[in-house]
Amino acid sequence: EPPTACREKQYLINSQCCSLCQPGQKLVSDCTEFTETECLPCGESEFLDTWNRETHCHQHKYCDPNLGLRVQQKGTSETDTICTCEEGWHCTSEACESCVLHRSCSPGFGVKQIATGVSDTICEPCPVGFFSNVSSAFEKCHPWTSCETKDLVVQQAGTNKTDVVCGPQDRLR
C-alpha cells in the first residue's frame, strides 16, 4: 500500500517517499522506485537554508552601497548574506534593506535622546499635557498652550498630537 505520510527530511511524490535535498543543494530530479533523489549544490552567490525540494536556489542578498549598505557576513551555499549599514548609519528594519542617518519620532512622540554615531534616536510618547504634531529627529514634546495665562478658556482639548485650542471667555451679561 502506498504511503500517505513520510519521515522527516522526506517528501511524498508519485505515491512514494523521496529524500529532501540538504541545505545548500537544489532538486534536480525526484527519486523513483529505482533511483535516489538527485540534488546539485547551489551556484556561486546562491543559497538554500533548509532541507528542500526547490528546483532553484535563492540569490544572495545584494548589499547596495548606493543605499548605504555593506556586507556584514558573506553568504554561503546554506546562508544568505547579511547586510549592515555604513558606520554612523542605522538599518530601517531587522532585514536591513536600507539605511537612515537616524530615525525620526512620529507625531504623538517626542525625542528623548538625539542620535549619535552609535545609537539611534530614542523616542518617547508625549505624556498628558504635551504634544507633538510633527515627525522629527530633535524636537521634544511641546507643552499644551496655557489658555488661562492668556485670559482665555480651553475650547478644544489637546491630545498627544494636537495643542489645545483657546477661545474667549463667555462674558456674563
Partner: nanobody
C-alpha cells in the same frame, strides 16, 4: 530626484568665519526638517545642527553651541550654517540631510579646513 548641493567650504584660520549653504531640489523643501552633519577625517558622523520646517525650532550639538547658527530660506529652498569662532576641531566635510535621512537624501558635502 532629491538633490542637496552644499557649498561655502574652504580653508580658514582659527577664529575665522564661514557660511555654508545647501541648495535643495526635487522635494518640497518647506515641509522638511533639515540637518547639518559633519565627518572629520577618520572619524564618525557628528550631528551638528537641525532646524524644523518653519524655522522656529533649532538644535545644536554642545560642541558648536554659541558659535554656529542654522537658518533656512524656504522661498529660496536653501539651508544655511553660519560658522563663527572656528577651531581646528571643526575641520570636516559638512553634509546637509533631510528627513527621513535615507542614504540617497544625502549631499556630497563641502570641506571645511581650519588651519593656520
Amino acid at each position: 530626484e532629491v538633490q542637496l548641493l552644499e557649498s561655502g567650504g574652504g580653508l580658514v584660520q582659527p577664529g575665522g568665519s564661514l557660511r555654508l549653504s545647501c541648495a535643495a531640489s526635487g522635494f518640497t523643501f518647506r515641509d522638511y526638517e533639515m540637518w547639518w552633519v559633519r565627518q572629520a577625517p577618520g572619524k564618525g558622523l557628528e550631528r551638528v545642527s537641525a532646524i524644523n520646517p518653519a524655522g522656529g525650532y533649532t538644535y545644536y550639538a554642545d560642541s558648536v553651541k554659541g558659535r554656529f547658527t542654522i537658518s533656512r530660506d524656504n522661498s529660496k529652498n536653501t539651508l544655511y550654517l553660519q560658522m563663527n569662532s572656528l577651531r581646528a576641531e571643526d575641520t570636516a566635510v559638512y553634509h546637509c540631510a533631510k528627513l527621513p535621512f535615507t542614504f540617497e537624501d544625502w549631499g556630497q558635502g563641502t570641506l571645511v579646513t581650519v588651519s593656520s
